[in-house]
């Protein structure tokens, strides 16, 4: 017969490691006992457990509560054991020695590797503002054993750079995502993706981009000057802009204070029934924490009688 095991067994930190040892014997052969030992413990072999066909499992004091048999059903030729709650200190070599009847003793070694999965973290860069050059949007760091892989998943155009630092049998990886901020990036997701053999699936951390900007301001409402005549009701001017953070609006009159009865409602300036004293230069001032913009318009309130009188004069002059 012969022993079947694995050259290398890999287990995730905190999980249970199955140490395989199966005797593939000829018919009629029996396994009397299986002795498990750690064989790289420095001072010779360190016994883990003894698996006896008649008396069951005996675990050595150093591994009390940490070594078990796999759950049933069990094959009498299977000397595999479970090492519970693996820690990094368990990395090393293990040997199973199988005593069989009538073939004698066999032994096999395996190497146990413990994977330490990463706990990634994402750190946003400095505040992003339109008009900046290439700027750090976010950095993502993950440390594990072996080295994790850190990539980015996003629709945003940018460049990545990564650096890694190795310790003994583990590595810390940091990847940075740089971009040239523009308003179109606002609200776009930037996702750090971390891969590692100790993770069942990639870990993803998403950061939503916020780019500060302030668009040019413009004023709507004067498209048809003929509507701005004495006595007209419901006349209004609306200031148009957009920004991140959302901007605030302020209205002033360049050639004096706002006339009485004129209502300021955020981006809108509402007029009472128009009179000639509403004529003037009005300024919309738009601002947010990033910038400020101004737009000014000239309101010229028409007197219909004055206009028709002028027309008569023109006619008579002809």
């Amino acid at each position: 017969g012969e022993l079947e095991t694995s050259d290398v067994v890999t287990v995730v930190l905190g999980q249970d490691a199955k140490l395989p040892c199966f005797y593939r014997g000829d018919s009629g052969e029996q396994v009397g006992q299986v002795a498990w030992a750690r064989v790289d413990a420095g001072e010779g072999a360190q016994e883990l457990a003894l698996l006896h066909s008649k008396y069951g499992l005996h675990v050595s004091p150093a591994y009390e509560g940490r070594v078990e048999q796999p759950p049933p059903p069990r094959n009498p030729l299977d000397g595999s054991v479970l090492l519970r709650n693996a820690v990094q200190a368990d990395e090393g070599e293990y040997e199973c020695r199988v005593s069989t009847f009538p073939a004698g003793s066999f032994q096999a070694r395996l190497r146990l590797r413990v994977l330490v999965p990463p706990l990634p973290s994402l750190n946003p860069g400095p505040a992003l503002e339109e008009g900046q050059g290439l700027t750090l949007a976010a950095s993502c760091t993950a440390e594990g054993s072996p080295a994790p892989s850190v990539t980015w998943d996003t629709e945003v155009k940018g460049t990545t750079s990564s650096r890694s630092f190795k310790h003994s049998r583990s590595a810390a990886v940091t990847s940075e995502f740089h971009l040239v901020p523009s308003r179109s990036m606002n609200g776009q997701p930037l996702t750090c993706v971390v891969s590692h053999p100790g993770l069942l699936q990639d870990q993803r951390i998403t950061h939503i981009l916020h780019v500060s900007f302030l668009a040019e301001a413009s004023v709507r409402g004067l498209e048809d000057q003929n509507l701005w005549h004495i006595g007209r009701e419901g006349a209004m001017l609306k200031c148009l802009s957009e920004g991140q953070p959302p901007p605030s609006y302020n209205w002033t009159r360049l050639d004096g204070p706002l006339p009485s009865g004129v209502r300021v409602d955020g981006d809108t300036l509402g007029f009472p029934p128009l009179t000639t004293e509403h004529s003037g230069i009005y300024v919309c001032h738009v601002s947010n924490e990033f910038s400020s913009r101004d737009s000014q318009v000239t309101v010229d309130v028409l007197d219909p009688q004055e206009d028709s009188g002028k027309q008569v004069d023109l006619v008579s002059a002809s």
Epitope: D7, V8, V39, D40, A41, G42, G92, E93, R109, R111, G144, S145, P146, A147, P148, S149, V150, T151, S162, S164, K166, S168, R169, A171, V173, S195, H196, P197
Partner: antibody, heavy 116, light 108 residues
Framework: QVQLVQSGAEVKKPGASVKVSCKAS????????IHWVRQAPGQGLEWMGW????????NYAQKFQGRVTMTRDTSISTAYMELSRLRSDDTAVYYC?????????WGQGTLVTVSS | EIVLTQSPGTLSLSPGERATLSCRTS???????LAWYQQKPGQAPRLLIY???NRATGIPDRFSGSGSGTDFTLTISRLEPEDFAVYYC?????????FGQGTKVEIK
């Protein structure tokens, strides 16, 4: 700094054995596995196996089972690779390498020539 | 065993050009277990990239690695005269450890 220094070139006859040494310095010798990799002239890299300097435990590639023996002497931080029953196609440069998952440091290589 | 196939076998380029080297694996390999090495004539291999995308200590940032599953890539953004060499990929996640057959980057 980490260094792996190997023994000098060898010329052997078919059927003979060769033993190549690899002396480590600049780190704790027993803290890292040592692997052996060979490269025939004009060919690629071929993994031969590893030794755990702490325990002396070994694992050999199937192709070399029965012909290769890896040992170590922790008192002088040196690993050894012995290949027996040499054939002409064993002519190669033999490298030792330190394992930190990947192979982060390599010896300079030892040329073994098998010729009658 | 996991077989690694590198392409192309030889890459003829001029200094300053971009080099893209491919490594395909016969079975899926975790990116954490893939490395790239550079070997110049008469020298031992040197670790360039580990964990598929992480540059080893002292490796210039013109070298970058990427990929996952069965497809991995080594990119040299602008070839310097000292970059003309043979490049090997390696998987170290399962036994036996295996290498690709190598890609030679030569001066055009």
């Amino acid at each position: 700094q980490v260094q792996l220094v190997q023994s000098g070139a060898e010329v052997k006859k078919p059927g003979a054995s060769v033993k190549v040494s690899c002396k480590a310095s600049g780190y704790t010798f027993t803290g890292y596995y040592i692997h052996w990799v060979r490269q025939a002239p004009g060919q690629g890299l071929e993994w031969m196996g590893w030794i755990n300097p702490n325990s002396g435990g070994t694992n050999y590639a199937q192709k070399f089972q029965g012909r290769v023996t890896m040992t170590r002497d922790t008192s002088i931080s040196t690993a050894y690779m012995e290949l027996s029953r040499l054939r002409s196609d064993d002519t190669a440069v033999y490298y030792c390498a330190r394992e930190d998952w990947d192979f982060d440091y390599w010896g300079q290589g030892t040329l073994v020539t098998v010729s009658s | 065993e996991i077989v690694l196939t590198q392409s192309p076998g030889t890459l003829s380029l001029s200094p300053g050009e971009r080099a893209t080297l491919s490594c395909r694996t016969s079975q899926s390999v975790s990116s954490s277990y893939l490395a790239w090495y550079q070997q110049k004539p008469g020298q031992a291999p040197r670790l360039l990239i580990y964990g598929a995308s992480n540059r080893a200590t002292g490796i210039p940032d013109r070298f970058s690695g990427s990929g996952s599953g069965t497809d991995f890539t080594l990119t040299i953004s602008r070839l310097e005269p000292e970059d003309f060499a043979v490049y090997y990929c390696q998987q170290y996640g399962s036994s036996p450890i295996t290498f690709g057959q190598g890609t030679k980057v030569e001066i055009k």
